[in-house]
């Protein structure tokens, strides 16, 4: 499982997330959806996938997950 | 293997309706969000519409907006575009995509669209 | 609407050139920008995810930058499969939206 890339929150997205339990805040359309399907992902021991492009940190980055965390692929979902 | 198979293209007349269909296999279509993407001839590529895993949103570009309803069947893996009072411009190849996110912490971030169909062709036209 | 503007729009180079094609966007997008490489009658491709980040399987002499309203695809030696149309496209916010292309041709 691949990490993310880098967080890239520059939007104006609430930090912490004003979503309640369950759901997620989906960035693009700026608003809570229903995330039950998600699960945590189980971290891939470091440089086991590539490099997170290096894009410059956002204001909001250092709440919720930061760049060390490892991020959960979702092809499509939501 | 991932892929998305495109079907119910074809011509049509200006007023009248067409559905398109695709069918999804090799990924957890229920768990997938999914767009309408659309080229006119010779022309830039046009988001269309997006739909969640579970239907509960759907988004709409503003030149379909009222004509078109995207929709999903994920007992059948596959993906509908309902396409309505159909014009002259809405002539192009249509194109299904899975939508590209990643979950950090509680935030869904979207990078794109990872799986294209083949594209079916719609023609309107008298 | 974010609007996206590709330049050049179309381009002439040589199998071993380094290629860049150049995406303007209307308004600050952080780095929510993609590229895709689109061949005659087939769909396009996802290259480039988040400005820079290889799509999987993607070959490594394609690489992305950028971040606000300036972004920049770059193939640092052009190989004969990589004739083709390049697009970028915006996931900031709906509508999402696509460059016009960049068309790479050989010289």
């Known amino acids: 499982m691949r990490r993310g890339p880098r967080s890239l929150r520059g939007r104006d997205a609430p930090a912490p997330t004003p979503c309640v339990p369950a759901e997620c805040f989906d960035l693009l359309v700026r608003h809570c959806v229903a995330c039950g399907l998600l699960r945590t992902p189980r971290p891939k021991p470091a440089g086991a996938s590539s490099p997170a492009p290096r894009t410059a940190l956002q204001p909001q980055e250092s709440v919720g997950a930061g760049a060390g965390e490892a991020a959960l692929p979702l092809p499509g979902l939501l | 293997e991932v892929q998305l198979v495109q079907s119910g293209g074809g011509v049509v007349q200006p007023g009248r309706s067409l559905r398109l269909s695709c069918a999804a296999s090799g990924f957890t279509f229920s768990s997938s969000g999914m767009h309408w993407v659309r080229q006119a001839p010779g022309k830039c590529l046009e988001w269309v519409a997006v739909?969640?895993?579970?239907?509960?949103?759907?988004y709409y570009g503003d030149s379909v907006k009222g004509r078109f309803t995207i929709s999903r069947d994920n007992s059948k893996n596959t993906l509908y575009l309902q396409m309505n009072s159909l014009r002259d411009e809405d002539t192009a190849v249509y194109y299904c995509?899975?939508?590209?996110?990643?979950?950090?912490?509680?935030?869904?971030?979207?990078?794109?669209?990872?799986?294209w169909g083949q594209g079916t062709t719609v023609t309107v036209s008298s | 609407e974010i609007v996206l503007t590709q330049s050049p729009s179309s381009l002439s180079a040589s199998v071993g050139d380094r290629v860049t094609i150049t995406c303007r966007a209307s308004q600050s997008i952080s780095s929510y920008l993609n590229w895709y490489q689109q061949k005659p009658g087939k769909a396009p491709k996802l290259l480039i995810y988040a400005a820079s980040s290889l799509q999987s399987g993607v070959p490594s002499r394609f690489s992305g930058s950028g971040s606000g309203t300036d972004f920049t695809l770059t193939i640092s030696s052009l190989q004969p499969e990589d004739f083709a149309t390049y697009y970028c496209q915006q996931s900031y916010s709906t509508p999402l939206t696509f460059g016009c292309g960049t068309k790479v041709e050989i010289k």
């Open positions: 995509a899975r939508r590209f996110t990643y979950l950090r912490g509680w935030y869904i971030e979207d990078y794109g669209l990872d799986v």
């Open positions: 739909i969640w895993y579970d239907a509960s949103n759907k």
